[in-house]
Structure formats: C-alpha cells, structure tokens
C-alpha cells in the first residue's frame, strides 16, 4: 500500500537544517547574520536575562498550544438535545422571587438516556434563544452545586439586538459531573453581572421560554424554543469498539 | 526552483472523492453504507431536523475555526515589557480604600516607546506574580473606561497554591486602545469576583507589588517582580518592509 | 491566507486551496445521506517550492520564504490549515440519527 | 498522537515527529544568537500510505484510516501538527534584542 | 467467536405449533438485529423476518408468507432469540436458520440449523 | 418484492479456472448485493456485502462487482474446497430477498 523508498535520514537533517538557517534569518528579515563588533564583553544584562526568561516560560492563564485530536475524536459525535425541564415543574418554585437570574433544570434521567456514561461525552452546550435587547447586558452562567449554594462558570457580554439570536455556553465538564453523580434533577442559573460597587444587577435579557414578567413565574414554554443541552457523544457500540482497538499501528 | 509535473486535476479529485468514501465511512465505524430498506417513507421528522440546524449553525459564543495566521505572524517579534507605575504615583490615591480591589496602572508614553504604532502590537499580556494563596479566589480584571467606570475584561479561579505563580492575562485589544489614544496613564483593576446575593467580596490573593495590608497603601515594590506589560510586536523598520512587499507570490 | 477567499477568485499555480463539491448521489452513489445531499469538502493542492538555496539570490528568497515553507521542513508540502466539521442525517434500522463528523471540509491550506 | 512522547520511544516506520537539536555554533556556524545555545526543533518524517483500496480488506483497512489518512487527502504527507515558538537573544550593534519566533519546534506531527 | 445454535425442530402435524430457539454467543447480543431464514428441501434461501436490536427498541419485522402466523422474539437476559410457529403448513418444512443481521442488508453469521417437518 | 435471478442454475469448472456467477435484480438496488456460500450439508457464510467488500477470513480469490441491477461473484482460481451453491441476497428493500443459487461442481 505504500511506495517503499530507503530514506537517507543524513540528508534529511542536512536539508531541515539548511531549511532552519533559512527559516531564522527570514523571520528576523536578515539578509545575512548581523555582524558581532559591537557586542559589548561580559554577560547578558540582567534586566535583558529577565526578559528572556519571562518570554520563555509559560504561565498560567496562558494559552498553550492546542492538543491535538485524540482518536476518539476522529470518529463522529452523535448529536442529541435534551430540553429543559418546563417552567411549572415544583423545583422552579424556590427560585421565583429573583430579577437578577433566570433558573433552568434538566432532568439527568433524559441525558443518561443520551449518553450512558460520562467519558462518551465529548460535548455538550446549554444553548438560550435571547429575544431581542435594548441595552448591552452583562450576564454570567452558574451551576447548582449543592443545596443552595452556585457555582461560576462562564459570562458573556450581550450587545443590543432587534431580532432573536441563539446563544451557547460550553457546559461538558459540568454535563459530564451530572452524568457521574446521582442526582435527578440538575440546573442553571443565568444572571446578571454583579460588579461590587453599582447595584443596578437586573437581568434585562429576555430569554425563550419564560414570560417577560417576573422571571420565575409560570411560564409560556415556546415550543421547541426553550433552553435545551446539545449534546455530542460517542455512541456506546462505538465506544466499545474503540477500547477493543487500542493498538499503535 | 520547483520540479514542474502536469497535474492531472480530475486524477486528484477522484482519489479525493474515494478518500472521502473511506472517511465518512470510518468515522461512522461503518464497514459499509446501512441499508435504508426499513427507513419509513416520508420527509425526515421535525425534531430531527431541528436536531440538525441546530448542529449546523453556528451559534454567538461558540468557538468558530481559529483563523490562520496572517502573514504578519510569521515573521519575528521584539519582546519588551513595561513596568507597572509605582504605588506611590498621585494616581493611586483615590483608589486606596477597596477591599475588594487593587490597581494597577501604565505610563502609555512607555507603551508607545515600545511600539510606536498600534498596529505593531502582535500580543500584549499583564503578568502578575502572586503570592502563596490559602483559599481558591475568583478574580474578575477590568481596564479603567472613563473617568469613574471601568470595563470588565476577563476572570480567573485561582486554586489554593504554597508557592509563588505567574498569571498571565491576554491585554492586546486593550494596549492596542490605549496606543491609539491620547491619554497619558491607563489602568487595570483586580477585583474580587461579587455574585449578586454573596457579600463577602474581599480580595484575599496577594500581589507582589503591593503591601499586604491595606490592599492601595504605599507598596513595597519588590524589585522586577512587579506587574508588568509584557509586549509582543513588529520592530518598525521590519513592519515598513512588510508593508512594500504585500504582494502575493 | 491560502483560503477560499483567496483561491477560488485567483489563478494560483502554488499551493492553495481547491473547489470540491461532493453530491453524495452522483459522486459517491449513496443515498442512505438524507442531509445534506452534499457538501463543499475542497482539497489542497500546488507545490510548495522549496526555495531555499545557497546559490538563490538571498533578499528575493527573504520574501519569499514565509510563503513557501514556513515550517522549514526539508520537503513542504501542501496541506489543510482550517478545517470545519460536517453534521449529516442518517437511520440506522428505522432510527433517524444525527451526527457529527469533524475536520471534513477545507478552509484553507497552507505549505507544511 | 505522534508526539515526542510516543515516536521518541517507539522504532514507527510510518509518519512521526524525528528528534533534531540544533546546535547554533556547530550546525550553524552562527555565534550570533546569545541565548539559547541551541534547541529542540525535530522533524516530520515517514510515509502516510494511503490505504484506501477497493482491493484491501475493507474492515482492516477501516480501523487504520483515521492514522494514515484522516484527512481524506489524495495523496496525505507527514507534517506538523503541533509546534511551539523560540524566544532567543541577539545583538543588533550594541543593543541586546529579545525576539520570539513563532512555530520553531515541533512537537507532534500528523498526516493530513 | 460468534456462534449461533438452533434447536427445537422436530415432525409437526398440519395445523400445530412449534417454537424454536437460537442460543447467541461471542457479541452483544442486545446491539443486533437477529434473523430467522429458512430453506426448504432443494430449494434457495427465504427470509422471514427478524427483530431489531435495543436503540430500534426490539420492533419485528415479517415477510408476508409468515405474518400473523410466525412471532419472531428475544431474551436478552439468556441471549436467546425464539421463533414460535403457529397453523403450520407443509410448506412450512425445511431448515430453519437463525442469522444475525447487520445494518448494512446483510446476514454476517449463521446457525447450522434446524430441520422441521410438517407431516400428517 | 424485489426478484433476484441468478445465472447458471449450475456449473461446472476444473481447478485453476476462473469463473463468474451472474445475478440480476428486477429494479436498482444501489450495490445492497450481498453473496453466501453454502456447501453441502453445511452451513451458510457470508462471503461478500456490499457488492465488492470481502467478509474477514475469506480468501481473497473471491471477488464482486457491479452497480443497479447487475452483479458479478468472480473466483479468480477455482479451488476444490469452492465446490458449494452460491446465493445472492438484495439488501436495499424489505422484505430481504434471495436469487434461487447457483451450483458449483469440480469437473
């Protein structure tokens, strides 16, 4: 299946390194080598020696190289979408009174009907159709964690709108949590940005899928339009065939 | 230079095409294509079909492709960084109360030393070096706006830590502002992340740079460890190259 | 960039991306795709010219070189840079499914 | 993936990364560039058969598509998949210089 | 390695009833669809009908010759795949097969079989 | 229903020989055409699916090809252990359906 051809592997380090000469000199737009009669004797500078430094290591906050795939990703995702539970449900009653956040469960039932077992998840996405916006809005996506208390996830700043648009927070590793925990029902909160001086913290962001009065109330559930989890996942007899397989070539 | 071949285009596109074949099949782990003898007869379902927009669209925050680097990037980039404006400039003075916050501020006549025209600026980061941490913090940055306001940029969870570490924030789109305009000092402010209903939004991460007591009192800088601006950009003379050989090959 | 942008409107000999409609039906005699009926998969192609020589006079080479081998690899080649995923809609038995397949369709390319 | 990782420690025929340290003042003649002495920049090397033939044994061939051709290429060829830059210090006259240059080491490569 | 075994064949009298069964080893059983596909004496192969696999929710499928009289069922539980004959013809006589299905139209594994006979 | 006709009924070959078994269907079945062999007293096997691909652990002296209605099984060198009858089977459209099967004898 392949043309066999011996490789003189001499000559190709001898041409990447030609290639490498070539590939510096370039990127600093050196026709030539810059001339060292100037250089000063002694060390590097320290402040310079610190600067080098900084340069070349990485630091936390930023952004490596991106990994690349594993094999499982090769392999295609099956898509399901799992709707949230309908707003008259009793577990929105405890979250009714607020106007800085808006309150969206999923039944884990339905998600592990999806997708049997967390390591098949390989991504899942709450996606919100916000109706149209006056003013720019600062919101901010958390998680239920335990009784009563949130967690932070993800913000977003909303630029006005006039017309309907579909927003997505990437929510796997949450997803993936509720797949491997026991509980029922699990949730979103979407809020407002609080900053700690203004107080000014109301979500105008209309979302489908809950009136436009006080947001907890009963709501009037827009068909298929209503928060939903999209999610990407590996089927279970692809899974299975994949860990048969974990041979290198 | 290049070995010149005719290329028999249709050649290329039917082993492309027999290459797709294989991929699809492959990915769906098929060995060949599933029979439709038992598909019901009909258009497709609805929720399928919405099942499939909603995977074909691309959605407002969702991460698109990266783009490909343009030319620009190929080519070399002059490192430098500016230190930030010692805690005991006049500016800090109206900032020294906050619990919640520290400031952090630039002398932009520095900013445009390095890199005289916005344009140049390929990456720009704020680093700072934190000290050891006892409990996780959610960190919120903001760029100072106008004359009392300020604009949310990033966050950041910081875990619990018996060491010192570098963080590091991308701040391009925010120096490449500041060089466009004419304001002589511009500033970042570290905040504590304040949720709606939480009170407690005490900074508890220690800066180096700043005194461990009250967060905006005269600091003791400990030498080059304060937070700086580390700057990435095309060297002038090479961008002016740049700009007289945008041709294509 | 080497993208669609840019390919489909020039007459580029070099490396560069190439138009490729694939109709599921007439190219690949399948009907068991019920969407899309096909899709614009493009492929790369055009030579990546080594360029780098001692005897190549040296400032044009400069300009070039970013161009033609970036990568300083000791034989480029040309091949995809962006790439974007491809949902499609089948049934397995009597069960419609929708999945995903990534990396089917070429944005771009770029000399490797 | 055919990183450092795997294709440092393993005799792979087919494409992966080669190791490759580039010693500036022996490989290079160069004595101009003050820091780093040298560095790791390794590179792509092997073939990527195409083993997408009506004639093999279509379910042997499907469990290696995705390493030898997951891009669907015409004719794949074995480039970098993941690279990483090189900060370095030199002088321009009297003034020391710290400057970055991007996609300088490979650290996986692939066939596309 | 696969393996499909068939029993219960036997002589019936017109108008009786019988079940087979098939016993599945070497795969998951509940990700097939499983088969019933017979031969009579001399003759070519003729496929009755099968049973779909858990995502297609265990639904059959019959061919017309079979409808109403044959039911086509499975234990997941002792991987097991049962076909209960009823009114039984003497055209019903030959060898039965279980096979399993794939998605693709085809049978990739058969059972050796199982001979019935409908006499008087 | 769809009908499958395969030709010949039988046939007769010597060892070495190259031989194709025919088979057709009464409408376009879009490369669903499947091929088994049973020899005598034995069970059936699955040879080839899909017009062309050979199942695992079949020798790779079998071979198929064709499109629409028309299909070929070619045995590039006939060897003893090939004497059985080959059936062909549409997989496009319920209800499944065979040929009648082709017989295969060693002169």
């Known amino acids: 299946l392949s043309t066999c051809k011996t490789i003189d592997m001499e000559l190709v380090k001898r041409k990447r390194i030609e290639a490498i000469r070539g590939q510096i000199l370039s990127k600093l737009r050196l026709a030539s080598p810059p001339s060292q009669g100037e250089v000063p004797p002694g060390p590097l500078p320290e402040a310079v020696l610190a600067l080098y430094n900084s340069t070349r290591d990485r630091v936390a906050g930023e952004s490596a190289e991106p990994e690349p795939e594993p094999e499982a990703d090769y392999y295609a995702k099956e898509v399901t979408r799992v709707l949230m539970v309908e707003t008259h449900n009793e577990i929105y009653d405890k979250f009714k009174q607020s106007t800085h956040s808006i309150y969206m469960f999923f039944n884990t039932s339905e998600l592990r009907e999806a997708v049997p077992e967390p390591v098949l998840l390989s991504r899942a996405e709450l996606r919100l159709l916000r109706l149209k916006l006056k003013v720019e809005q600062h919101v901010e996506l958390y998680q239920k964690y335990s009784n009563n208390s949130w967690r932070y996830l993800s913000n977003r700043l909303l630029a006005p709108s006039d017309s309907p648009e579909w927003l997505s927070f990437d929510v796997t590793g949450v997803v993936r949590q509720w797949l491997s925990r026991g509980g029922e029902i699990e949730g979103f909160r979407l809020s407002a940005h609080c900053s700690c001086d203004s107080r000014d913290n109301t979500l105008q962001v209309d979302i489908n899928g809950f009136t436009t009065g006080r947001r907890g109330d009963l709501a009037t559930i827009h068909g298929m339009n209503r928060p939903f989890l999209l999610l990407m996942a590996t089927p279970l007899e692809r899974a299975q065939h994949l860990q048969s397989s974990r041979h290198r070539r | 230079l290049s070995t010149c071949k005719t290329i028999d285009m249709e050649l290329v596109k039917r082993k492309r095409i027999e290459a797709i074949r294989g991929q699809i099949l492959s990915k769906l782990r098929l060995a060949s294509p599933p029979s439709q003898g038992e598909v019901p007869p009909g258009p497709l379902p609805e929720a399928v079909l919405a099942l499939y927009n909603s995977t074909r669209d691309r959605v407002a925050g969702e991460s698109a492709e990266p783009e490909p680097e343009p030319e620009a990037d190929y080519y070399a980039k002059e490192v430098t960084r500016v230190l930030m404006v010692e805690t005991h400039n006049e500016i800090y003075d109206k900032f020294k109360q906050s619990t919640h916050s520290i400031y952090m501020f630039f002398n932009t006549s520095e900013l445009r030393e390095a890199v005289p025209e916005p344009v140049l600026l390929s990456r720009a980061e704020l680093r700072l070096l934190r000290l050891k941490l006892k409990v996780e913090q959610h960190v919120e940055l903001y760029q100072k706006y106008s004359n009392n306001s300020w604009r949310y940029l990033s966050n950041r969870l910081l875990a619990p830590s018996d060491s010192p570490e570098w963080l590091s924030f991308d701040v391009t789109g925010v120096v490449r502002q500041w060089l466009s305009r004419g304001g002589e000092i511009e500033g970042f402010r570290l905040s504590a992340h304040c949720s709606c209903d939480s009170r407690d939004n005490t900074l508890q991460v220690d800066i180096n740079g700043f005194t461990t007591g009250r967060r905006g009192d005269l600091a003791t800088i400990h030498g080059m460890n304060r937070p700086f601006l580390l700057l990435m950009a095309t060297p002038l003379e090479r961008a002016q190259h740049l700009q007289s050989s945008r041709h294509r090959r | 960039a080497l993208d669609t942008n840019y390919c489909f409107s020039s007459t580029e000999k070099n490396c560069c991306v190439r138009q490729l409609y694939i109709d599921f039906r007439k190219d690949l005699g399948w009907k068991w795709i019920h969407e899309p009926k096909g899709y614009h998969a493009n492929f790369c192609l055009g030579p990546c010219p080594y360029i780098w020589s001692l005897d190549t006079q040296y400032s044009k080479v400069l300009a070039l070189y970013n161009q033609h081998n970036p990568g300083a690899s000791a034989a480029p080649c040309c091949v995809p840079q962006a790439l974007e995923p491809l949902p499609i809609v089948y049934y397995v038995g009597r069960k419609p499914k929708v999945e995903q397949l990534s990396n089917m369709i070429v944005r771009s390319c770029k000399c490797s | 993936a055919l990183d450092t990782n795997y294709c440092f420690s393993s005799t792979e025929k087919n494409c992966c990364v080669r190791q490759l340290y580039i010693d500036f003042r022996k490989d290079l003649g160069w004595k101009w560039i003050h820091e780093p002495k040298g560095y790791h920049a390794n590179f792509c090397l092997g073939p990527c058969p195409y083993i997408w033939s009506l004639d093999t044994q279509y379910s042997k061939v499907l469990a290696l598509y995705n390493q030898h051709n997951p891009g669907a290429s015409a004719a794949p060829c074995c480039v970098p998949q993941a690279l990483e830059p090189l900060p370095i210090v030199y002088y321009v006259g009297r003034k020391p210089k710290v400057e970055q240059l991007s996609n300088m080491i490979v650290r996986s490569c692939k066939c596309s | 390695e696969v393996q499909l075994v068939e029993s219960g064949g036997g002589l019936v009298q017109p108008g009786g009833s019988l079940r087979l069964s098939c016993a599945a080893s070497g795969f998951t059983f509940t990700d097939y669809y499983m088969s019933w596909v017979r031969q009579a004496p001399g003759k070519g192969l003729e496929w009755l009908g099968f049973i779909r696999n858990k995502p297609n929710g265990y639904t059959t499928e019959y061919s017309a010759s079979v409808k109403g009289r044959f039911t086509i069922s499975r234990d997941n539980s002792q991987n097991s795949l049962y076909l209960q004959m009823n009114s039984l013809k003497t055209e019903d006589t030959a060898v039965y097969y279980c096979?399993?299905?794939?998605?693709?139209?085809?049978?990739?594994?058969w059972g050796q079989g199982t001979l019935l006979t409908v006499s008087s | 229903d769809i009908q499958m006709t395969q030709s010949p009924s039988s046939l007769s070959a010597s060892v070495g020989d190259r031989l194709t078994i025919s088979c057709r269907a009464s409408?376009?079945?879009?490369?669903?055409l499947n091929w088994y062999q049973q020899k005598p007293g034995k069970t059936v096997k699955l040879l080839i699916y899909y017009t062309s691909r050979l199942h695992s652990g079949v020798p790779s002296r079998f071979s198929g090809s064709g499109s629409g209605t028309d299909y070929t099984l070619t045995i590039s060198s006939l060897q003893p252990e090939d004497v059985a009858t080959y059936f062909c089977q549409q997989g496009d459209t319920l209800p499944w359906t065979f040929g009648q099967g082709t017989k295969l004898e060693i002169k």
């Open positions: 096979a399993r299905y794939t998605g693709g139209g085809y049978f990739d594994y």
């Open positions: 409408q376009d079945i879009s490369n669903y």
